[in-house]
Interface confidence: medium
Amino acid sequence: LPEMAQPVDPAHNVSRLHRLPRDCQELFQVGERQSGLFEIQPQGSPPFLVNCKMTSDGGWTVIQRRHDGSVDFNRPWEAYKAGFGDPHGEFWLGLEKVHSITGDRNSRLAVQLRDWDGNAELLQFSVHLGGEDTAYSLQLTAPVAGQLGATTVPPSGLSVPFSTWDQDHDLRRDKNCAKSLSGGWWFGTCSHSNLNGQYFRSIPQQRQKLKKGIFWKTWRGRYYPLQATTMLIQPMAAEAAS
């Protein structure tokens, strides 16, 4: 995502809202240009703190970050629902918090990937995230921009629920993807992507172990454990929702 070239004098303007901002995008709209840890209060939610990344594309909420293996991502449903990790380092914001930010709106999901050779890839999707009653299903609402679309995520319109080892909602009848891989994810058939997999600093020899890693199949391949990932979300204006 493009960095802010020109930091603006930060948001004393927030006071003109007379309430906490709903999300990072609203923060951006009232003049905040500094990325960091901010308190927000989505509609109908208690306040909580989020990492905002301010870019020339507006304000984005960071919902996931991996870069050093310092946090265990192989956690149960309740942990993925509530969130875990370190705001300074590796973390998962929490499905309930993400859903409170997006509400019923369509959103832009940005996925930043980095391999061990310093190569980086940015993917952007238009998505809709359901609530817990849908197992936080992720639905693609528009075609994917860029080269890496089709086989990485469900086809446009298909909804994939979130799965953990103790709550198996994946699209495989014969397998629990979260259990045979690692971490919680929107698992379709286990093989497209998993950014919450096990962190490997060196590539293990056994494929059985390797498949548990962090991967994005159409970028560096099914058995290439990525070095770093960041996921960010930005709700679209209400009228953009279908």
């Epitope: 004393h12 927030v14 905040e32 500094q34 960091g36 208690p46 306040p47 300074h88």
Partner: nanobody
Amino acid sequence: EVQLVESGGGLVQAGGSLRLSCAASGRPFSMYAMGWFRQAPGKEREFVTVITWSGGSTYYADSVKGRFTISKDIAKNTVYLQMNSLKPDDMAVYYCAAARRYGNLYNTNNYDYWGQGTQVTVSS
């Protein structure tokens, strides 16, 4: 002008507990958030935890999550840091800081007022 005074530091054995206090005087009702940072010898000052004054949102560094608890007593204009299961790694000077306005809560530059610090020593 706001003054912050920390207390409660000291020497404790690994596995023990301490409770730090940070009393704000002056115009503390104008605060947006109060946080704790720490600095070990030869290291940079690092974020530990923060609490927002009105919303009451809290955030912890992963290294202290589940062991440290931040709380506030608005009537006394005081923020507390309850530190349990202390480890040698927790040994540092602990600083209380106050942010006057809405902003980035783990950037030290966004905190307007700082206490003088209180030493926490953990012996193994």
